[in-house]
C-alpha cells in the first residue's frame, strides 16, 4: 500500500472511530435493564454516563441528569474522564493529521515535518482509542460486578405482609454504547497505527538510497527514492524541477511515469 493511501486510510478510519467515541460518550444506553429471567416490568430502565432514563410501556420516556459530582461513584467519574480525554486527544489528533496529510499542500512544509506530524497524530489516535477501550471496559467490569452482586440478593424479603412482600432489584447489563465504544476505540487505535506506519514511509532513511539505480544524465534531475514516493528533503530547489521518465527508480517502483505522489 502506498504511503499516501496508508496515511489517508488511517486518517479516515481514525475519524470514523473518533466519531464513534463521541457517539458512545453521549449515548444513554451504557447499561440497560436486564430483562432475562426477571419479572417482566412495564418500565424499562437504562443509564448513560450523564443521565439515567426510564421508558414506560406507555411510550413516555423520562431522563434525569446526574446533577451531582460528589455523589457519583468514583468509577463512573473515571470512565467519564477517560472518554473525555479520548475525545480531546482525538480532536488534537485530527487537527494535526489534517496538516500532516500528504495530499494536502500547506506552504513549504517538507516531508520530514509531515512525517513528524503524521507520527504525532498517529500516537494521539492510539492513546485516544486506548482511553476509550479502557473507559468502556472499566464500565463493563463495573456492570458485571454489580450484576452478580444483585443476582445474589435478587429478592430481599421485607417485613410487611408477614414477610411475604418482595422487592425486586433492577439488574443492569451491557448497553449498546459499550459495543459502540469498543468498536470505535478499536477503529481509532487501528487508524493511529496506520498513521504511524505511514510516517515510516514518509521519513527519509540512508538505506533507501542503496536501492536507487541512477540513470546517467547531465540534465538537472531530481532523484527520489521512489519506494517512498516522496522528496528526500535535501534541498527545496528540487520541488519544481521536472521529473524525467528515465529518472531515479527503486526496485519496488513499478511505475515509470510521474505519479500524483511525486508532487507535494
Amino acid at each position: 500500500m502506498s504511503v499516501t493511501a496508508c496515511q489517508g486510510l488511517g486518517f479516515v478510519v481514525s475519524l470514523i472511530g473518533f466519531a464513534g467515541i463521541i457517539a458512545a460518550t453521549c449515548m444513554d444506553q451504557w447499561s440497560t435493564q436486564d430483562l432475562y429471567n426477571n419479572p417482566v416490568t412495564a418500565v424499562f430502565n437504562y443509564q448513560g454516563l450523564w443521565r439515567s432514563c426510564v421508558r414506560e410501556s406507555s411510550g413516555f420516556t423520562e431522563c434525569r441528569g446526574y446533577f451531582t459530582l460528589l455523589g457519583l461513584p468514583a468509577m463512573l467519574q473515571a470512565v467519564r474522564a477517560l472518554m473525555i480525554v479520548g475525545i480531546v486527544l482525538g480532536v488534537i489528533g485530527i487537527l494535526v493529521s489534517i496538516f500532516a496529510l500528504k495530499c494536502i499542500r500547506i506552504g513549504s512544509m517538507d516531508d520530514s515535518a509531515k512525517a513528524k506530524m503524521t507520527l504525532t497524530s498517529g500516537i494521539l489516535f492510539i492513546i485516544s482509542g486506548i482511553c476509550a477501550i479502557i473507559g468502556v471496559s472499566v464500565f463493563a467490569n463495573m456492570l458485571v460486578t454489580n450484576f452478580w452482586m444483585s443476582t445474589a440478593n435478587m429478592y430481599s424479603g421485607m417485613g410487611g405482609m408477614g414477610g411475604m412482600v418482595q422487592t425486586v432489584q433492577t439488574r443492569y447489563t451491557f448497553g449498546a454504547a459499550l459495543f459502540v465504544g469498543w468498536v470505535a476505540g478499536g477503529l481509532t487505535l487501528i487508524g493511529g497505527v496506520m498513521m504511524c506506519i505511514a510516517c515510516r514511509g514518509l521519513t527519509p532513511d540512508d538505506s533507501n538510497f542503496k536501492a536507487v539505480s541512477y540513470h546517467a544524465s547531465g540534465q538537472n534531475v531530481a532523484y527520489r527514492p521512489g519506494g517512498f514516493k516522496a522528496s528526500t528533503g535535501f534541498g527545496s530547489n528540487t520541488r519544481n524541477k521536472k521529473i524525467y521518465d528515465g529518472g531515479a527508480r527503486t526496485e519496488d517502483d513499478e511505475q515509470s511515469h510521474p505519479t500524483k505522489y511525486d508532487y507535494v
Partner: antibody, heavy 118, light 113 residues
C-alpha cells in the same frame, strides 16, 4: 379530543366466538398502546392484555391466553379483541383503554357487554 | 402475579369528612430508575367505565379535584379524599402498573354515612 368507541352489546351461545371492536380517534393511533379490561357483573376489574398498534406486538395475561386474541387495524384506527370458546363465565363488560403516563389508563371506551347464554 | 389488597372493602363517611382507602401490593412498585411508584387509582360509578384519578401513586390527573390525593411508596399506598362530596360515591380501585400482568385491587365501595 381522545375518544374510544366500542361496538354494541352481544349475546352469544356457549362455544361460539365474539369480536369486540374499539375505534380510536383524536390522537395518533399507532403511538399508544391499547389495553383490554374485563369486568364481570358485580365484580372487579381484570386486565386481559394489550397491543401496540404500531408494531402489532401483544402482551397477554396468562389467564386469558388462548381465550382472547387482540389485533389492530392501523388503516381504520381500530383495535379488536376476539374471545373464543365462549362460556358463561365470559359474560362481562369488556373495556378498551388507552395508556397514559405511569402506564395508567386515562381514556376508556364505554364498554361492551358480552352475554353468553344458551 | 402481583396481588393488590385494598382495605376496607366498603367505607361509609359523612359528607365533608375525610375518607381514606388503603392499598397494599405483594411486591414493591417503586422503580429505582426514576424513584416513581407505579400505582394508579381509579374511580368507577355505576354503569360507567373507570375514571383515572391518580397515577405514579401521587400525581393527580388534570381535571381531578384537589380533595383527592395519593400517597405511599413501595408496597403501601393510600388514597385520601379530604372532604367527601356527594358525587364521590363510587367504587375505588388501585392498580399495579409496574409488573405484567397489570392487576387491580378488589375495590373499595365508598358510601355516605
Amino acid at each position: 379530543q381522545v375518544q374510544l368507541v366500542q361496538s354494541g352489546a352481544e349475546v352469544k351461545k356457549p362455544g361460539s366466538s365474539v369480536k369486540v371492536s374499539c375505534k380510536a380517534s383524536g390522537y395518533a393511533f399507532s403511538n399508544y398502546l391499547i389495553e383490554w379490561v374485563k369486568q364481570a357483573p358485580g365484580q372487579g376489574l381484570e386486565w386481559i392484555g394489550l397491543i401496540n398498534p404500531g408494531s402489532g406486538g401483544t402482551n397477554y395475561n396468562e389467564k386469558f391466553k388462548g381465550k382472547a386474541t387482540i389485533t389492530a387495524d392501523k388503516s381504520t384506527s381500530t383495535a379488536y379483541m376476539e374471545l373464543s370458546s365462549l362460556r358463561s363465565e365470559d359474560t362481562a363488560v369488556y373495556y378498551c383503554a388507552r395508556v397514559y403516563y405511569g402506564n395508567s389508563f386515562a381514556y376508556w371506551g364505554q364498554g361492551t357487554l358480552v352475554t353468553v347464554s344458551s | 402475579d402481583i396481588v393488590m389488597t385494598q382495605s376496607p372493602d366498603s367505607l361509609a363517611v359523612s359528607l365533608g369528612e375525610r375518607a381514606t382507602i388503603s392499598c397494599k401490593s405483594s411486591q414493591s412498585l417503586l422503580n429505582s430508575g426514576n424513584q416513581k411508584n407505579y400505582l394508579t387509582w381509579y374511580q368507577q360509578k355505576p354503569g360507567q367505565p373507570p375514571k383515572l384519578l391518580i397515577y405514579w401513586a401521587s400525581t393527580r390527573e388534570s381535571g381531578v379535584p384537589d380533595r383527592f390525593s395519593g400517597s405511599g411508596s413501595g408496597t403501601d399506598f393510600t388514597l385520601t379524599i379530604s372532604s367527601l362530596q356527594a358525587e364521590d360515591v363510587a367504587v375505588y380501585y388501585c392498580q399495579n402498573d409496574y409488573f405484567y400482568p397489570f392487576t387491580f385491587g378488589q375495590g373499595t365501595k365508598l358510601e355516605i354515612k
